[in-house]
Interface confidence: low
């Protein structure tokens, strides 16, 4: 048993048929002495009397906000979870397995830049009891400051007859030079607790592999004289670490017609224009990468050639 | 410590073609190692990162572009002196900083090319001959080191009587590669930042 | 859910061409991104093609460029993998793929959340 914060702790079970469960005694917070007694949940059952209760804790009817009394005084509360073990391996029932970029990924992070500021997201089928906290660091040993805030409910989407909930927090590198060569990944544990389930949910990086830049802005269309041609521009994303001439990025260009016929066309470029055969109906868009390290692509910017 | 915006004419930098060829090399080496040594932990999850220039050179305090020398948390305490002649730095304005910035490039290449040259005369002698380093990264690092022109001291080749650990020699290769990406990533950022100043 | 299956699939020769379909279940198939991957004895699965949902937007690997053609009828709940000039190095397991999430690269796995069981195409000479 271990405190995950004042009042709340955590039991640690190995689930199987049958387990023994884990001896717990609780303590009332209380300079009193006699007359006390306990009571689990709403149940005004007693459950035994004197400063301390010794219980057995075998599976969630256990579990529970235990209180002590005296005389119809509430004196204090000991919140018990659960944690199971099963097979040796800590259960991950609350959130969803996005399954990128490997099985068993449950938190998925991104940058947007590298100034140290970084996104995590997850995904759970539960709307309703459930509770997230997030810690970060740079490194697991002599850890170094990251603050994050706190989990938000991000987006909601129907899969087939089930709703699926997106959370996300925002953290960001108390101390980080954009320039920095990592050596120590981040460290980010997510604390997931649903009705009297408690599971945490780790994961380790480096802010150059999650790096995703803003799409490109001011992507705009200026026809060449004489020419069905335009001559299609675009900028670095306000988002995007400085000086650009550091921090460069690549582009895709892409060319997409209205007709099923036509064909896209698609060109890469470390330029901020380009040149574009603009068809009727057809729209161009821009994506970015960093230059010289391969992380993920940006969203499309597009504009129609209309 | 830090590269001032007064830095080579436009057209008057050589080095940039040349780190754009050594992080090329560097990555499809990278990936070469992380195919053939697939039974090997030899991904970024799975490897240590150490850096063999670390206390040694200063590369990225040394080489900070201007605009980050505001950002405290860039700013290293670490002195380290530099020789200061560089065929790279082919204008006048050129300042003390920028070459403290090349010549620390020049070090850094200098001791990745004795510590691979030492990894590959080892990897030579494995019987089962999986691995070798790429000519090619070798003959770049080569060429980015002559495009910098420092006069230094010629480090030896490590030279060890023990028979070689093929397995700790491979995880060793491992480790200096994807170290030697993250610098040559800095390496290709530094030098388009003076290409473009 | 989505269920996706796939046909066409068979042997032909060298140069020869192939029309494999792959018809998803469920009522918003146009809400999906579709592609065609593919898996050779004892390699990674690799990426064919990819369509967007209304069929505006498509991609290629390299080595299909011209040769294969990806197209969907949104109101048959099919898409199409044209194969023509087959090559020896064609031959794999092609499986269609279905992603609601469209922010993720569509050339690549993890955009897709529903997967068909495959379709055996070989090429002989």
């Known amino acids: 048993i271990w405190e995950l914060k004042k009042d709340v702790y955590v039991v640690e079970l190995d689930w199987y048929p049958d387990a023994p469960g884990e001896m717990v005694v609780l303590t009332c917070d209380t300079p009193e002495e006699d007359g006390i007694t306990w009571t689990l949940d709403q149940s005004s059952e007693v459950l035994g009397s004197g400063k301390t209760l010794t219980i057995q804790v075998k599976e969630f009817g256990d579990a529970g906000q235990y209180t002590c009394h005296k005389g119809g005084e509430v004196l204090s509360h000991s919140l018990l979870l659960l944690h199971k073990k099963e097979d040796g391996i800590w259960s991950t029932d609350i959130l969803k397995d996005q399954k990128e970029p490997k099985n068993k990924t449950f938190l998925r992070c991104e940058a947007k830049n590298y100034s140290g500021r970084f996104t995590c997201w997850w995904l759970t089928t539960i709307s309703t009891d459930l509770t997230f906290s997030v810690k970060s660091s740079r490194g697991s040993s002599d850890p170094q400051g990251v603050t994050c805030g706190a989990a938000t409910l991000s987006a909601e989407r129907v899969r087939g007859d089930n709703k699926e909930y997106e959370y996300s927090v925002e953290c960001q590198e108390d101390s980080a030079c954009p320039a920095a060569e990592e050596s120590l990944p981040i460290e980010v544990m997510v604390d997931a607790v649903h009705k009297l389930k408690y599971e945490n949910y780790t994961s380790s990086f480096f802010i150059r592999d999650i790096i995703k830049p803003d799409p490109p802005k001011n992507l705009q269309l200026k026809p060449l004289k004489n020419s069905r041609q335009v001559e299609v521009s675009w900028e670095y994303p306000d988002t995007w670490s400085t000086p650009h001439s550091y921090f460069s990025l690549t582009f895709c260009v892409q060319v997409q017609g209205k007709s099923k016929r036509e064909k896209k066309d698609r060109v890469f470029t470390d330029k901020t224009s380009a040149t574009v055969i603009c068809r009727k109906n057809a729209s161009i868009s821009v994506r970015a990468q960093d230059r010289y390290y391969s992380s993920s692509w940006s969203e499309w910017a597009s504009v129609p050639c209309s | 410590r830090n590269l001032p915006v007064a830095t080579p004419d436009p057209g008057m930098f050589p080095c940039l073609h040349h780190s754009q060829n050594l992080l090329r090399a560097v990555s499809n080496m990278l990936q070469k190692a992380r195919q053939t040594l697939e039974f090997y932990p030899c991904t970024s999850e799975e490897i240590d990162h150490e850096d063999i220039t670390k206390d040694k050179t200063s590369t990225v305090e040394a080489c900070l572009p201007l605009e980050l020398t505001k950002n405290e948390s860039c700013l290293n305490s670490r002195e380290t002196s530099f020789i200061t002649n560089g065929s790279c730095l082919a204008s006048r304005k050129t300042s003390f900083m920028m070459a403290l910035c090349l010549s620390s490039i020049y070090e850094d290449l200098k001791m990745y090319q004795v510590e691979f040259k030492t990894m590959n005369a080892k990897l030579l002698m494995d019987p089962k001959r999986q691995i070798f380093l790429d000519q090619n990264m070798l003959a770049v690092i080569d060429e980015l080191m002559q495009a910098l022109n420092f006069n230094s001291e010629t480090v030896p080749q490590k030279s060890s009587l023990e028979e070689p650990d093929f397995y700790k020699t491979k995880i060793k290769l491992c480790i200096l590669l994807h170290a030697f990406r993250i610098r040559a990533v800095t390496i290709d950022r530094v030098m388009s930042y003076l290409n473009a100043s | 859910e989505v269920q996706l299956v796939e046909s066409g699939g068979g042997s032909v020769q060298v140069g020869g061409s192939l029309r494999l379909s792959c018809v998803a279940s469920g009522r918003t198939f146009n809400m999906y991104v579709m592609g065609w991957f593919r898996q050779a004895p004892g390699k990674e699965r690799e990426f064919v093609a990819a369509?967007?949902?209304?069929?505006?937007?498509?991609d290629y690997r390299d080595s299909v460029k011209g040769r294969f053609t990806i197209s969907r009828d949104n109101a048959k709940n099919t898409m199409y993998l044209q194969m023509n000039s087959l090559k020896p190095e064609d031959t794999a397991v092609y499986h269609c793929?279905?992603?609601?999430?469209?922010?993720?690269?569509?050339?690549?796995?993890?955009?897709?959340?529903?997967w068909g069981q495959g379709t055996q195409v070989t090429v002989s000479s």
């Open positions: 369509i967007s949902g209304e069929g505006l937007i498509s």
């Open positions: 793929a279905a992603g609601q999430w469209t922010n993720g690269p569509f050339t690549r796995e993890r955009t897709y959340e529903y």
